[in-house]
């Protein structure tokens, strides 16, 4: 009966209300709909005000309900990365208070007149795993070979060594292994641990920055009409009871979200390669067993240097001449000590392996999240009709919704009914958060083969709107020489996410 | 020419203490330790330590720690040794002696006899 | 402490002969071993340094070698003035201990 109920504006008013906007503007009856632009034209509650207004509405409403999944995702992406970050940096700091703790009186003055040399090591093993562009095996060999000159003078204090004499020890070393294997051996392991510690929490910041950055990306006019008509034109039409079918709900968002979809092969690679590298946390060089043992190496480099210290000088004055003697004397008695070496394998604490299983489980749930992100807002933000059946809105009338669903990604949303996609404009913040997922991910890969990876290669594509991994403080170009060692400043380096200086932590 | 220059001989009795000087020239007096080394008589020569000329820090061989003091008095570039408390084996020649930049004693005083005697 | 053993404690030879005396250290001393002559009532006179170098105005039938902890003073077509005591010190690390020295004599 064209006087009945449904010709009156009630329902409308209502809603129309509730969603805070003037009842002023809302008819008392249907009118007639050829003011309408985004509704079919047939008989309506809306004003072509009413119309507008809704549709920012449900622009503004699909935007935040992309912002609150992203937000959900980034919040897990966000409390990983703290964690692990966490535990690495505490292992790291465990190690060094245990240095700090035992080699004075395991090693006297040998430490003592170089706990800044050991300090420093600690610094740029830290701005190392913050993803500074140090180069760690230069970083290490550096480390030794100054430690090597300080050590050296230490053990002969009755010798005059002048820098090019120094130069010439320096040289004669790289045959004569003073240290013995401690060297090598920190070296092939903490590169292989570092590398993969900071890559896993590199990838957690990079994965976090994109769900971040493409949350921002504003939907387009052609998405903008599309919801309208999905969320709110039944209304205008007298059908406010009539939810979306969902295929008719998928084909929109898929429209909407075609952008988004494509991210989803790159971010499938990009959580397989941070699953994957996770089995390079256990084990001998393993990121517990290395990074919370680095002191150990240190005792066992200073001790072998004792052991080999009369064939060391012998070689190197061999090779350098005899230096001259000490003009003030021979210096104090030697008193050699040796330091009792804690076992180098840490037990595992637990804590690691809670983390990684939780990390892996987390990360298999959101594998999907870019693909399967229009089925979830259809779902659980659209008010879906329980079935496709001839009752739901079909986007004209209430009816069965007919067409196919599309595919994923832009290039299936060719002959999308619903939301006019032109497949040759990709979004640029899009693709370029696909590139940072590669890159990332090619990082990983590396990792995962043990090679140290130049962080600063791809941080930059000159489009400013990269992922949070470059560099703070031309950190990423630092290197450190051995004649400036002490005049080294403290630097930050921020990984996604995180605000940190040398271990100490702020949110 | 470098050239080190020691008091002359002395006469002492058990428990007195003597001091003894070792004037050094032509060289600059902080830019080397001075040594002293004892020679009892008929015995061969036994390092005692030396006194780092920078700083008047004095360092003794673990047979001469107690009663033996080594000395400076910069502004003459002398050089002192004291023996407290002495005793008959204390009888010997103590020199000074400074060294040469790779070891070995090329200037040595003419050295100075103590003869502890009751 | 490296302690240095002097071999012999002494020794007898003629005018012309060719002698060696030995210096033996507990420790190696990486050749900053000194070597020194003393005549009855005089000062010692530096002879060798580091081993193998000669000190100024030593006559050259005089020399040095040995390496570690074995050293030796050789002295070719000995002369009248080269008797007397000899002994060795070692320079390398604290203290700077003599031999017990080897006593020179004509026969």
């Known amino acids: 009966d064209p006087a009945s109920k449904s010709r009156s504006c009630g329902e409308v008013r209502q809603i129309y209300g509730a969603k805070g906007f003037s009842l002023s503007d809302v008819p008392q009856a249907e009118i007639s709909g050829e003011h309408l632009r985004i509704c079919p034209q047939g008989y309506t509650c809306c004003t072509s005000e009413m119309e507008e207004n809704l549709a920012n509405r449900s622009h503004a409403e699909l935007e935040t309900a992309l912002r609150d999944s992203s937000r959900v995702l980034q919040a897990m992406l966000a409390t990983q990365l703290r964690s692990f970050d966490d535990h690495f940096q505490h292992l790291l700091n465990d190690s060094e208070r245990t240095l700090q703790a035992t080699f004075p009186g395991a090693f006297g003055e040998l430490y003592t007149q170089n706990a800044r040399a050991f300090r420093d090591l600690y610094s740029e093993l830290r701005l190392y795993y913050r993803g500074a562009n140090l180069h760690l095996e230069e970083t290490l060999a550096e480390f030794w070979a100054r430690l090597l000159e300080r050590l050296f003078k230490q053990l002969h204090p009755q010798l005059l060594l002048p820098d090019d004499y120094l130069d010439c020890l320096g040289k004669q070393a790289e045959a004569l292994r003073p240290f013995g294997e401690a060297p090598r051996e920190l070296r092939l392991r903490a590169t292989r641990a570092f590398v993969a510690a900071r890559s896993f929490v590199q990838g957690l910041g990079v994965a976090s920055d994109v769900v971040r950055k493409v949350a921002q990306v504003p939907l387009g006019p052609e998405c903008s009409r599309a919801v309208m008509k999905l969320v709110y034109c039944a209304h205008c039409l007298g059908v406010p009871g009539a939810r979306p079918c969902p295929d008719y709900c998928r084909n929109v968002l898929k429209g909407c979200l075609a952008n988004q979809a494509d991210l989803d092969a790159e971010w499938r690679n990009l959580l397989d390669s941070m699953v994957l590298i996770t089995d390079k946390f256990w084990g001998t060089s393993g990121v517990e067993s290395v990074i919370g043992s680095v002191h150990t190496w240190l005792a066992e480099a200073i001790n072998a240097l004792q052991d080999n210290r009369d064939t060391l000088t012998a070689k190197v004055i061999q090779g350098c001449g005899n230096p001259k003697v000490n003009p003030q004397g021979p210096g104090p008695e030697e008193k050699r000590r040796r330091g009792k070496l804690a076992p180098r394998e840490r037990p595992p604490s637990g804590t690691l392996e809670k983390l990684v299983s939780e990390a892996k489980a987390q990360l298999r749930d959101v594998q999907d999240f870019w693909i399967s992100l229009p089925g979830t807002l259809c779902s659980e933000k659209m008010a879906l009709s329980t079935a496709s059946d001839d009752r739901c809105w079909n986007g004209m009338a209430r009816g069965r919704y007919l067409p196919e669903v599309m595919g994923d990604g832009l290039a299936n949303q060719i002959n999308n009914p619903e939301v006019e996609v032109d497949i040759t404009k990709p979004d640029m913040t899009i693709r370029q958060q696909i590139m940072q997922l590669k890159i990332m991910t090619n990082r990983l890969r590396s990792a995962y083969n043990g090679n140290d990876v130049d962080f600063q290669d791809a941080s930059d594509d000159g489009s400013g709107s990269g992922s949070g991994d470059g560099c703070l403080d031309d950190l990423c170009s630092r290197k450190v020489s051995r004649k400036s060692s002490s005049s080294r400043t403290p630097l930050t380096h921020a990984l996604p996410g995180l605000s940190e200086q040398e271990g100490q932590k702020t949110s | 020419q470098i050239q080190l220059v020691q008091s002359g001989p002395e006469l002492k009795k058990p428990g007195e203490t003597v001091k003894i000087s070792c004037k050094a020239s032509?060289?600059?007096?902080?830019?080397?330790?001075m040594n002293w080394v004892k020679q009892a008589p008929g015995k061969g020569l036994r390092w005692m330590g030396w006194i780092n000329t920078e700083t008047g820090e004095p360092t003794y061989t673990d047979d001469f720690k107690g009663r033996f003091a080594f000395s400076l008095e910069t502004s003459a570039s002398t050089a002192f040794l004291q023996i407290n408390n002495l005793r008959n084996e204390d009888t010997a020649t103590y020199f000074c002696?400074?060294?040469?930049?790779?070891?070995?004693?090329?200037?040595w005083g003419q050295g100075t006899l103590v003869t502890v005697s009751s | 402490d490296i302690q240095m053993t002097q071999s012999p404690a002494s020794l007898s030879a003629s005018v012309g002969e060719t002698v060696t005396i030995t210096c033996r250290a507990s420790g190696n001393v990486h050749n900053y071993l000194a070597w020194y002559q003393q005549k009855q009532g005089k000062s010692p006179q530096l002879l060798v340094y580091t081993a193998k170098t000669l000190a100024d105005g030593v006559p050259s039938r005089f020399s040095g070698s040995g390496s570690g902890t074995q050293y030796s003073l050789k002295i070719n077509s000995l002369q009248p003035e080269d008797f007397g005591t000899y002994y060795c010190q070692h320079f390398w690390s604290n203290p700077w201990t003599f031999g017990g020295g080897t006593k020179l004599e004509i026969k």
């Open positions: 002696a400074r060294h040469y930049d790779y070891g070995g004693f090329p200037y």
């Open positions: 032509g060289y600059a007096f902080t830019d080397y330790s």
